[in-house]
Amino acid sequence: GQNITARIGEPLVLKCKGAPKKPPQQLEWKLNTGRTEAWKVLSPQGGSWDSVAHVLPNGSLLLPAVGIQDEGTFRCRTTNRNGKETKSNYRVRVYQIPGKPEILDPASELTAGIPSKVGTCVSDGGYPLGTLSWHMDGKLLVPDGKGVSVKEQTRRHPDTGLFTLQSELMVTPAGGGGPPPTFSCSFSPGLPRRRASYTAPIQPSVWEPGPLEVRLLVEPEGGAVAPGETVTLTCEAPAQPPPQIHWMKDGMSLPLPPSPVLLLPEVGPQDEGTYSCVATHPNRGPQESLPISISVETGEDGPTAGSEGGSGLGTLALA
């Protein structure tokens, strides 16, 4: 048999080999396609199938406008005037070249060290299914789930059966002050064997954030408090996503869950010391605040009555 590739919407003529050039002809066309369930023999007189396929006076079969449902097998059998039988067999596949791919919502700026959306590449109106690929500085980007990730979506138009492909690219750009990377997207058709078509390239700038600024605030101000008062320590580290905050006392990590606020209720001498907070950001590592000293003013009589000494951790609370 012969493989035929036809463009959707275009006419297609299949020759019935060995058929007399004009009637009378002894020939039979039959087809098995998306429009049939088994073999359909076409009536030589024509009829309701004529809009899809009909036999021409020379015995060829005309498909006036090929559609997706016409993919399949077409066979002709003819007997010439000497009684010799000839068979023709065609395997028809169809295609439609989509519009040039484009990048929607292209990013103007990416943040170094942070996963950032580059854009969404769209190819509309193709058949059969092709593939979208991303390129950075001319090289194919392979998703690794870490620094490069791609989210793909395929939709099929309910009426035409044509495909729309979408591919969203996320990258975690490296810092280092080199030239910003150039991104492009390409569509490779499933049929026929054709070169890929490319979008225009985009070149978002890469912003490199400085180190985290971590500030520690204390209430009441100054850090000198009377016994039994409550001290509130607040750690500020503006960043997206919000960093995790851990607390230190006298250079030792406090065994508490992360929180931006540390409460010291009813302070006693055991709570005295130097406090700092450590902000840990997924893309920027840990950054420690300047320390703050907490002192409990006990008056002239020595330690406050009833205070227990020790680490004082039993009295700490996280807001």
Epitope: R35, E37, A38, Q45, G46, S48, W49, D50, S51, V52
Partner: antibody, heavy 119, light 107 residues
Framework: EVQLVESGGGLVQPGRSLKLSCVVS????????MTWIRQTPGKGLEWVAS????????YYPDSVKDRFTISRDNAKSTLYLQMNSLRSEDTATYYC????????????WGQGVMVTVSS | DIQMTQSPSSMSVSLGDTITITCRAS??????VNWFQQKPGKSPRRMIY???NLADGVPSRFSGSRSGSIYSLTISSLESEDVADYHC?????????FGSGTKVEIK
């Protein structure tokens, strides 16, 4: 909204002629095959004639072949049925319908027009 | 020519009943069978296309099925507005052929 409006029916003597028209709106006329179907009083439906979208192919059952002619004017979005040598058995309500090929199986119908063949 | 043998010719049923009308094709017509509803004094309305597909705006109590050369229209939980004549049609081969019709009425 898709509309098909037939006209031209009436009482006619056997052997005489009559021409039915069907003006359509609400869709791209030249994208579709069109068909005339008739219904005799108290009886079933019968296919009368079909025409392809360009108008260059026409199809008839033996009962009306060589007497009836289906045609179309795509510029006017109008379908016609020229009926010659009318017989009493042609008495029926005639419907104009969209379709006739395997891709569109009569999804829209006109309101029908009555043709009575009687002396 | 293809014959479409439709049965029954009429049926008298109760509201809420489930009914099935069948058409037998005398030769293979594939999926190319439609069902039409026709109320008195009105034009036919397509209900099922290509044997099993529900036409736009048709209530889901209507369904079409096929077993070999037998095509069926089923109305589940019949309502008063379903009282009508029902016709099948094969449009695979010329001459296009309708069934003889089934009249559905309420007891």
């Amino acid at each position: 909204e898709v509309q098909l409006v037939e006209s031209g029916g009436g009482l006619v003597q056997p052997g005489r002629s009559l021409k039915l028209s069907c003006v359509v709106s609400g869709f791209t006329f030249n994208n579709y095959w069109m068909t005339w179907i008739r219904q005799t009083p108290g009886k079933g439906l019968e296919w009368v004639a079909s025409i392809n979208n360009s108008g260059d192919n026409t199809y008839y059952p033996d009962s009306v072949k060589d007497r009836f002619t289906i045609s179309r004017d795509n510029a006017k979005s109008t379908l016609y049925l020229q009926m010659n040598s009318l017989r009493s058995e042609d008495t029926a309500t005639y419907y104009c319908t969209r379709g006739g090929d395997i891709t569109t199986g009569f999804d829209y119908w006109g309101q029908g027009v009555m043709v009575t063949v009687s002396s | 020519d293809i014959q479409m043998t439709q049965s029954p010719s009429s049926m008298s049923v109760s509201l809420g009943d489930t009914i099935t009308i069948t058409c037998r094709a005398s030769q293979d017509v594939g999926i190319y069978v439609n069902w039409f509803q026709q109320k008195p004094g009105k034009s036919p309305r397509r209900m099922i296309y290509r044997a099993t597909n529900l036409a736009d705006g048709v209530p889901s109590r209507f369904s079409g099925s096929r077993s070999g050369s037998i095509y069926s229209l089923t109305i589940s939980s019949l309502e008063s507005e379903d009282v009508a004549d029902y016709h099948c049609l094969e449009f695979d081969e010329h001459p296009l052929t309708f069934g003889s019709g089934t009249k559905v009425e309420i007891k």
